[in-house]
Amino acid sequence: CRTSECCFQDPPYSDADSGSASGPRDLSCYRISSAGYECSWQYEGPTAGVSHFLRCCLSSGRCCYFATGSATRLQFSDQAGVSVLHTVTLWVESWARNRTEKSPEVTLQLYKSVKYKPPLGDIKVSKLAGQLRMEWETPDNQVGAEVQFRHRTPSSSWKLGDCGPQDDDTESCLCPLEMNVAQEFQLRRRRLGSQGSSWSKWSSPVCVPPENPPQPQVRFSVEQLGRDGRRRLTLKEQPTQLELPEGCQGPAPGVEVTYQLQLHMLSCPCKAKATRTLPLEKMPYLSGAAYNVAVISSNRFGPGPNQTWHIPADTHTEPVALNISVGTNGTTMYWPARAQSTTYCIEWQPVGQEGSLATCNLTAPQDPDPAGMATYSWSRESGAMGQEKCYHITIFASAHPKKLTLWSTVLSTYHFGGNASAAGTPHHVSVKNHSLDSVSVDWAPSLLSTCPGVLKEYVVRCRDEDSNQVSEHPVQPTETQVTLSDLRAGVAYTVQVRADTAWLRGAWSQPQRFSIKVQVSD
């Protein structure tokens, strides 16, 4: 027999066995040109000393073979003795070590058997009623196909599925969607209506994440506020990575879960932008403000569950950094300025009303004054901090106020609003005999003492009404009692108390008269 022809004789070996695990597999035969044909197959097992024979039986009942040696691919023409217009059955017999192994057969019309391509290029993946929908452009001149898919998870082997017949310029497939594990899909096609024709190769892997992105399990820590008024947010625990099927472990797109950090600055609500989303890898610096932080997981199907934390405001206060002067025209704050053209956000809130919204003012970008200070003023009519109560004041600064992560804390302090001099006057001053020449003076704490760092000291004044002699006694802001000594019996005295701040002398309390009774001896 000529090598280019199919030999119509009995093959030169004994009967074959098709039951072994090794042997020829996946035979596919198709037309490659107007008169040219090709068959190819896989061989599993040791290849040394294996000879392959492509067998063919015609509709006439005659059978022939091509001897291909060690090759697992054969090309032949329509003149090779194989009928290409009628149905034929083809299979491979592989002979080695005195035994022959046989492939499954294919029965087809060679002329109609066109080598179909798998889905090529971009396979679009979407979710449809709890299922996975894949869609792709039909390869050129190959409209009319039967399509199969296979899929696996990280822990399962391939499972085969059917997409059904396709007859359009775009083809699609509905596949099962897993809730909590990633899947790898591959698709293949063959000519519609020719059951014996060969399947295309499998497509490149399509990697599909689980329907539910995993709950992000992460932990944060916040560093101390630095001298620059910023503190670093650091990730203590990375989110766990999704387990992937074998074909998706490289840089296969589509299966990845992205984690984003959503930052919401709760302080200073009058600024331009309160929320910023950034990749989890870019851990930001924060001001000393309070924030809500959310980690949002998302995949190609959209966002999944998120995890939210509250980062409380840094409560460290600078009692001396802020200067407040109250004049007839209004009130002005002064503080050490930052760089040129800095925007400041001044926020204040009555102490004890932290749940309510803070009052907030944004300055126009300002440069430091000649003394290196920044200022903010308001008129008395505005009513700002006009009530006689303690306010917590925080000042934030940014050269780029629209960029949430570029704000820093300038200072955080307390201020007593309204007429602090009068409001701070101590009440309920009482005098009690202490000994023969001393008394104990007590008073109710000044309202200023509710304002951390505001009350500098109490001053107790004692006047001898006989001699008009006056003595003043400074008292620590934490004390509300003092002992006056070296007093004379029978002399009338008046006592008054005032509360002073760093920048303001308080008003004296109502004079309280007392005297020590003369002791009469028996």
């Epitope: 098709s18 015609l58 009942g61 059978c63 149905t87 046989k102 057969e105 029965t107």
Partner: nanobody, 123 residues
């Protein structure tokens, strides 16, 4: 040498069903194509159905299409012919045959043959 033994024949009323079995002795039966033929007295053997060794290809005579089904169980070295909606014209001796080749049509020469089993369909 492959030895084939048919069983399952018998008498059945028109419209009824029978299942024929063809058991083989050879270990390499799973690499053989198997066909069923039938013969009535004074006539040539007539092709009924065939199945490839993998079970992936089957072929039927026009006269039995839609009524008969050929299948195989390679683990048991057996091929079956399920015959439904039987007609009196299906009365014949049914033979199974085996060959290393699978023929894609009714034509083909089979190397090994069984002794046959009688199927009678009464009206």
């Amino acid at each position: 040498q492959v030895q084939l033994v048919e069983s399952g024949g018998g008498l059945v009323q028109a419209g009824g069903s029978l299942r024929l079995s063809c058991a083989a002795s050879a270990r390499i039966f799973n690499s053989y194509a198997v066909a069923w033929f039938r013969q009535t007295p004074g006539k040539e053997r007539e092709f009924v159905a065939s199945i490839s060794w993998s079970g992936g290809s089957t072929n039927y005579a026009d006269s039995v299409k839609g009524r008969f089904t050929i299948s195989r169980d390679n683990a048991k070295n057996t091929v079956f012919l399920q015959m439904n909606s039987l007609k009196p014209a299906d009365t014949a001796v049914y033979y199974c045959a085996a060959d290393r080749n699978y023929y894609p049509s009714v034509l083909g020469k089979y190397t090994y043959w069984g002794q046959g089993t009688q199927v009678t369909v009464s009206s």
